[in-house]
């Protein structure tokens, strides 16, 4: 797995470089996670044809994966920094159960899956420090998450492959939207 941001050899070799600002650190963290997702998607798409055929193969997707909407204030039109930040943090917290599901779903990229999960936890911490209105952030119910995880893990192989593909695709889209929004803050 790649080395987490701030721990690569270049950072060690350049001790006089200015320390990263909070925004730069968040930006770097998201890009690191996106790199990890790309590697996981590569394995998923090589293993099955889910990536090409997911649209035709599904009538309905009730996974409730977090998604950015106009009301969340993260798009250029109607941009609202505080509302958007709350949405990003809430969304990442909601994604955590799906990232837990991804563990043990990969053969050659097992470390990568763990790195994505742990890096997301760190990203949430960075963002929580940045947020002023932490009370507005709702944490998912652990009991609900546990039963969802059980249900997802009980699916057959084909459905598990499809679930994996959909989680990675949605998480990538969510992080890309978050990255664009955070660059406006």
């Amino acid at each position: 797995a790649p080395v987490p941001p701030g721990e690569d050899s270049k950072d060690v070799a350049a001790p006089h470089r200015q320390p990263l600002t909070s925004s730069e650190r968040i930006d770097k963290q998201i890009r690191y996670i996106l790199d990890g997702i790309s590697a996981l998607r590569k394995e998923t798409c090589n293993k099955s044809n889910m990536c090409e055929s997911s649209k035709e193969a599904l009538a309905e997707n009730n996974l409730n994966l977090p998604k950015m909407a106009e009301k969340d204030g993260c798009f250029q039109s109607g941009f609202n920094e505080e509302t958007c930040l709350v949405k990003i943090i809430t969304g990442l917290l909601e994604f955590e159960v799906y990232l837990e599901y991804l563990q043990n779903r990969f053969e050659s990229s097992e470390e990568q899956a763990r790195a994505v999960q742990m890096s997301t936890k760190v990203l949430i911490q960075f963002l929580q420090k940045k947020a002023k209105n932490l009370d507005a952030i709702t944490t998912p119910d652990p009991t609900t998450n546990a039963s969802l995880l059980t249900k997802l893990q009980a699916q057959n192989q084909w459905l598990q492959d499809m679930t994996t593909h959909l989680i990675l695709r949605s998480f990538k889209e969510f992080l890309q939207s978050s990255l664009r929004a955070l660059r406006q803050m």
Epitope: N64, K151, W158, L159, T163
Partner: nanobody, 124 residues
Framework: DVQLVESGGGVVQPGGSLRLSCAAS????????MAWFRQAPGKEREFVAV????????YYADSVKGRFTISRDNAKNTVYLQMNSLRPEDTALYYC?????????????????WGQGTLVTVSS
């Protein structure tokens, strides 16, 4: 486990109607998305229609849209397929399938439980 038993197949003339039934037993029926697939001789099993858990939403293959209607009665643990304006190309073995998943598939591999099938023959 879930057991599925189809009935209602038979021989019908082109333009005629049939109503297939699928009786389920075993688990909580209302938790399952229920689908109908069909397989003509020498062809792959193909999606016909699916109904969501509570029966609120239905989806159909383009080839049967407007002619076939899927419905369910959770009190009777039964799913139905009303087939109208039948055509010779509708001739096939019709299977009922069930799955308990947040994903509702149109692909046969997205289903865990299958019936034995009921034969529908459309011929003059």
């Amino acid at each position: 486990d879930v057991q599925l038993v189809e009935s209602g197949g038979g021989v019908v003339q082109p333009g005629g109607s049939l109503r297939l039934s699928c009786a389920a037993s075993g688990r909580t029926f209302s938790n399952y998305a229920m689908a109908w697939f069909r397989q003509a001789p020498g062809k792959e099993r193909e999606f016909v229609a699916v109904i969501s858990y509570a029966g609120g939403r239905t989806y159909y293959a383009d080839s049967v849209k407007g002619r076939f209607t899927i419905s369910r009665d959770n009190a009777k643990n039964t799913v139905y397929l009303q087939m109208n304006s039948l055509r010779p190309e509708d001739t096939a073995l019709y299977y009922c399938a069930a799955v308990d998943s947040p994903l509702i598939a149109t692909h046969p591999r997205g289903y865990d439980y299958w019936g034995q099938g009921t034969l529908v023959t459309v011929s003059s």
